[in-house]
């Protein structure tokens, strides 16, 4: 009987630890996509609607803030698109990029953790263009560090929640 009680306590402890594991999945806020044709920071994301969720992490001022030290898997998916109904492209040669950046407040510094993308030729003769970037990686993150996303040509972002998103989840503690 004691073994059973111990076992159930163990399950509960495991479960509560799992439930406390930090994660976030943030989707683009289509009503507030910045403008510009150069690299800009995307600061407006949903954290609590549709597919977006967050737990034991903080979203503030456009940045995802780490609350617990640990090893995290970070990912970002960015889709760019253009349809001729919205007008013409001012240039047909495009650099479509995403940058996942870590900022540390304690020791003021900023590092690009991941980048992805390509140069594209989107001909004016085509009705529709589409390009998707997915980056992901495993990083040691400390409490208080902030993750942000920068992209080129934000006016070409696909605003759907299944197209432009980023997130993180803790995989293990730092030994």
């Amino acid at each position: 009987e004691k073994a059973m009680v111990d076992g159930s306590w163990l399950d509960l402890a495991k479960r509560s630890k799992l439930e406390a594991q930090p994660f976030a999945h943030l989707t683009i806020n289509a009503t507030d996509i910045p403008s510009g044709s150069h690299k800009v920071s995307l600061s407006s994301w949903y954290h609590d609607r549709g597919w977006a969720k967050i737990s034991n992490m903080t979203f503030s001022n456009g940045k995802l803030i780490v609350n617990q030290d640990g090893f995290y898997y970070l990912y970002a998916n960015i889709c760019f698109r253009h349809h001729e109904t919205s007008g013409d492209l001012a240039t047909e040669y495009l650099q479509l990029m995403v940058y996942v950046t870590k900022t540390s407040i304690k020791i003021p510094s900023s590092h690009t953790l991941m980048k992805g993308g390509s140069t594209k030729y989107w001909s004016g003769n085509s009705e529709f263009h589409f390009y998707s970037i997915n980056v992901g990686g495993f990083f040691k993150l400390r409490s208080g560090e902030e993750i942000s996303i920068e992209v080129s040509n934000p006016s070409l972002l696909d605003p759907d929640q299944d197209a432009t998103y980023f997130g993180a989840f803790k995989v293990r503690d730092i030994d």
Partner: antibody
């Protein structure tokens, strides 16, 4: 304030060419596209082409392809539209118009014409 | 090639009347639809962009609505200075115009 000032009226014989200018002021010329639109007597407005004043890229209506050249002089903040091999059907008022979607705000030429020139009447007659 | 069709081609109304002009696109254009006012000898004026957004400086009696393939421009209370020809436009295509006159 934003202004587009066009050159004066022109009379040409069939087969000749005409070059209309459009001088911009009150904004950063290189950050916007300029469109050319015309209206023949009793007809609807007709889009002819655009130029990205920043990089010189152009796009033209199929109807005018091969007959039209659009250029710009960034130092003079001026766009030019030249139409060749004129015929009587080219008699129209020619307008330049600024695309409201500036390059600072993105790279889509959105076809929202927020400021227009006063128009240039081109008469083609023998 | 998208074709824009306006109706009516002309209308006559009294000062203070509510005036509605319709524009149809030959296929769906989402909300990429603009309205312009043209007066003889004057530069055209952008009234409405993106189907319903009022251009800065345009009186609030002008409004736009619609999406997909059907759009309307409404003048809630016609004024003498509104006498003009109105055009809808999607990218490279313009409607044929609606001439508005005072009774």
């Amino acid at each position: 304030q934003v202004q587009l000032v066009q050159s004066g009226a022109e009379v040409r014989k069939p087969g000749a060419s005409v070059k209309v200018s459009c001088k911009a002021s009150g904004y950063d010329f290189s950050n916007y596209a300029i469109h050319w639109v015309r209206q023949a007597p009793g007809q609807r407005l007709e889009w002819m082409g655009w130029i990205n004043a920043g990089n010189g890229n152009t796009k033209f209506s199929q109807k005018f392809q091969g007959r039209i050249t659009v250029t710009r002089d960034t130092a003079a903040s001026t766009a030019y539209m030249e139409l060749r091999s004129l015929r009587s059907e080219d008699t129209a008022v020619y307008y330049c118009a600024r695309d409201s979607s500036g390059m600072v705000r993105g790279i889509i030429i959105a076809y929202y014409f927020d400021y227009w020139g006063q128009g240039t009447l081109v008469t083609v007659s023998s | 090639e998208i074709v824009m069709t306006q109706s009516p081609s002309s209308l006559s109304a009294s000062v203070g009347d509510r005036v509605t002009i319709t524009c149809r696109a030959s296929q769906s254009i989402s909300r990429y639809l603009n309205w312009y006012q043209l007066k003889p000898g004057k530069a055209p004026r952008l009234l409405i962009y993106g189907a319903s957004s009022l251009q800065s400086g345009v009186p609030s009696r002008f409004s736009g609505s619609g999406s997909g393939a059907e759009f309307t421009l409404t003048i809630s209370s016609l004024q003498p200075e509104d006498i003009a020809t109105y055009y809808c436009q999607h990218t490279r295509a313009f409607g044929q115009g609606t001439k508005v006159e005072i009774k």
